[in-house]
């Protein structure tokens, strides 16, 4: 069990020419909201499948009214996180779909209008319990910036939130690195609250506020290894002689990072991201100043301006972390566009593009939708080697720049008169015919043979409310 969390940072016109000024341009006031859908796996063929992992809806954003002469401000967005609870194991690989909807509040013929402004889809691998992942996605002329993470709840642990156990509050015969764990049962009592920063993995307490160390660990917060032990050689889920539980596939279980550090899993190990003022494998070293040389990999150390941070490291390109201790995972910046696969070769980045895309960053759409703007709310549809615009109601032409004349094709049958309307057409049928296109003859007894669609008009009644 756990929860997937999504935070929208910004939504607005993307860079470049042809970007809309705002989502409410010339339409009166509107407000935005977001819908998120989670599907398991990475396959694209499931585009029409339900949101099997769950879905969530943001609150409505504040009402936004464009001021014609004023510079476009940041769009007011809904407050808070979007949270999608999941009951079962976190799958690790998933598809994330974020829809941005516009609700128009002005008076329109036909009532309030609702429009899907943008839909972005990301196929990702993500371990539960990891840090926030940031992303920027473009959908047509719009740009969406967001962060997301998955975290376990209800005493579940591990990268898939599948292990259910709780640390005992008393010491045991386990050796260093092996923590005792009780099954999740009613008699499992919650441990007392230990001293702040006390290692959840190597420390314990019997009284609130203390921090006593398991064998093999020392220091005020039980974060410093003391000595090795024969117990370390154990493998498998448990030792029959000691009843000790070997830490499983989740090295971050219990958060080995002290002093508020956050843990992220690496193959077979873990890595701590330390807050300012702390460093070391588990963020256990503190009280550091620039004189101690805390910035690695050529980082420039600057004395901190506030008491909480004795120094700040300005990292050179390619490195990050509070001590410049981490090499930047350049693929985490998602440089490959349009769903391309990123490969960090060390000396260079390479993008393996999906079918239909090319270029160093997969930025060229072979179907020619890239860089092709469809006007008046139209959306570009790929296929056939050329771009095609699916136009909004009332517009037509290659780029949706032409006002569509829906009557040009003479759609009203049997001599019906066609009238153009802002959102389509209406037919005024000749006597003896009915239907939205005057396609049905009225039977002599006044009853028509209707299809599954709704009936149209009585003879001579213009259908004004379409």
């Amino acid at each position: 069990a756990g929860v997937f969390e999504l935070q929208i940072h910004s939504f607005g016109p993307g860079p470049g020419p042809g970007a809309p000024r705002s989502p409410c341009s010339a339409r009166g006031p509107c407000r935005l909201f977001f819908r998120v859908c989670l599907k398991p796996g990475l396959s694209e063929e499931a585009a029409e499948s339900p949101c099997a992992l769950g879905a969530a809806l943001s609150a409505r954003g504040p009402v936004y009214t464009e001021q014609p002469e004023a510079p476009a401000p940041d769009l007011p967005l809904p407050n808070g996180l979007l949270q999608v609870p999941f009951r079962d194991a976190w799958p690790g690989t998933f598809s994330l779909i974020i829809e941005t909807w516009r609700e128009e509040l002005g008076d329109q013929i036909g009532g309030p209008a609702w429009s899907l402004l943008a839909r972005v889809t990301r196929r990702r691998r993500l371990a539960a319990g990891g840090p926030w992942a940031r992303d920027i996605q473009r959908a047509g002329a719009w740009e969406l910036r967001f962060s997301y993470r998955a975290r376990c709840e209800l005493l579940a642990v591990g990268t898939a939130c599948t292990r259910l156990c709780r640390p005992r509050s008393a010491p045991s015969r386990c050796g260093p690195g092996l923590r005792p764990c009780a099954p999740l049962e009613d008699e499992c009592e919650a441990p007392p609250v230990c001293r702040a920063g006390c290692s959840l993995e190597h420390g314990f307490c019997e009284q609130p506020g203390e921090c006593r160390c398991l064998e093999g660990w020392t220091g005020p917060l039980c974060t410093v290894p003391a000595s090795t032990s024969s117990c370390l050689g154990l493998r498998g889920p448990s030792s029959a002689t000691t009843g000790c539980l070997v830490p499983g596939p989740g090295p971050c279980d219990g958060n080995p990072c002290a002093n508020g550090g956050s843990c992220s899993e690496t193959p077979g190990s873990f890595e701590c991201t330390c807050p300012r003022g702390f460093y070391g494998l588990r963020c256990e070293v503190s009280g550091v100043t620039c004189a101690d040389g805390p910035c690695f990999n050529g980082g420039l150390c600057v004395g901190g301006a506030d008491p909480d941070s004795a120094y700040i490291c300005h990292c050179p390109p390619g490195f990050q972390g509070s001590n410049c201790e981490k090499r930047v995972d350049r693929c985490s910046l998602q440089p490959c566009r349009n769903g391309g696969l990123c490969l960090d070769l060390g000396h260079a980045l390479r993008c393996r593009c999906r079918a239909g895309f090319a270029g160093p960053r997969c930025e060229h759409n072979l179907d020619d939708c890239a860089g092709r703007a469809c006007a008046n709310g139209g959306t570009c549809v790929e296929g056939g080697g050329a771009h095609r615009c699916s136009c909004a109601l009332g517009f037509g032409g290659r780029d949706c720049r032409e006002r569509a004349d829906p009557c040009a094709a003479r759609p009203c049958a049997h001599g019906g008169r066609c009238y153009a309307h802002f959102s389509g057409l209406v037919c005024a049928c000749a006597p003896g015919y009915m239907g939205s296109r005057c396609e049905f003859p009225v039977h002599p007894d006044g009853v028509s043979a209707l299809p599954a669609a709704p009936p149209g008009l009585r003879p001579g009644d213009p259908q004004r409310y379409l």
């Epitope: 036909g110 609702w114 409310y465």
Partner: nanobody, 125 residues
Framework: QVHLMESGGGSVQAGGSLRLSCVAS????????MGWFRQAPGKEREGVAF????????YYGASVKGRFTISQDNAQTTVYLQMSSLKPEDTAMYYC??????????????????WGQGTQVTVSS
């Protein structure tokens, strides 16, 4: 494609009540809006009541506001129209409509791509 099935129509005296149901099947997870239109003999189609599924927002035509209530079930696959204080002018064929479109005007039939066969409501004085 979404398929719709209405039920609950019938005859009732003025001042009485009826409850219409519309069950959607098929690709119901794509539903954005559902609601009811009605058409009386010799009159144009009229929007009655709608619920935008993506938000749960409800809308009512001016002639039924305060008398009719639209609601949906937890699975968001069935909508109900509770009609109270019925009047003779409510007599019409009532059609359930659903939209899976990315753009729609709530009371505009063009925005709805799935329709039921209709159920007759007759109110006598």
């Amino acid at each position: 494609q979404v398929h719709l099935m209405e039920s609950g129509g019938g005859s009732v005296q003025a001042g009485g009540s009826l409850r219409l149901s519309c069950v959607a099947s098929g690709n119901t997870y794509r539903l954005n809006s559902m609601g009811w239109f009605r058409q009386a003999p010799g009159k144009e189609r009229e929007g009655v009541a709608f619920i935008v599924m993506i938000r749960g927002t409800t809308y009512y035509g001016a002639s039924v506001k305060g008398r009719f209530t639209i609601s949906q079930d937890n699975a968001q696959t069935t909508v109900y129209l509770q009609m109270s204080s019925l009047k003779p002018e409510d007599t019409a064929m009532y059609y359930c409509a659903a939209s899976t479109k990315d753009q729609f005007y709530v009371f505009n039939p063009i925005g709805y791509d799935s329709w039921g066969q209709g159920t007759q409501v007759t109110v006598s004085s």
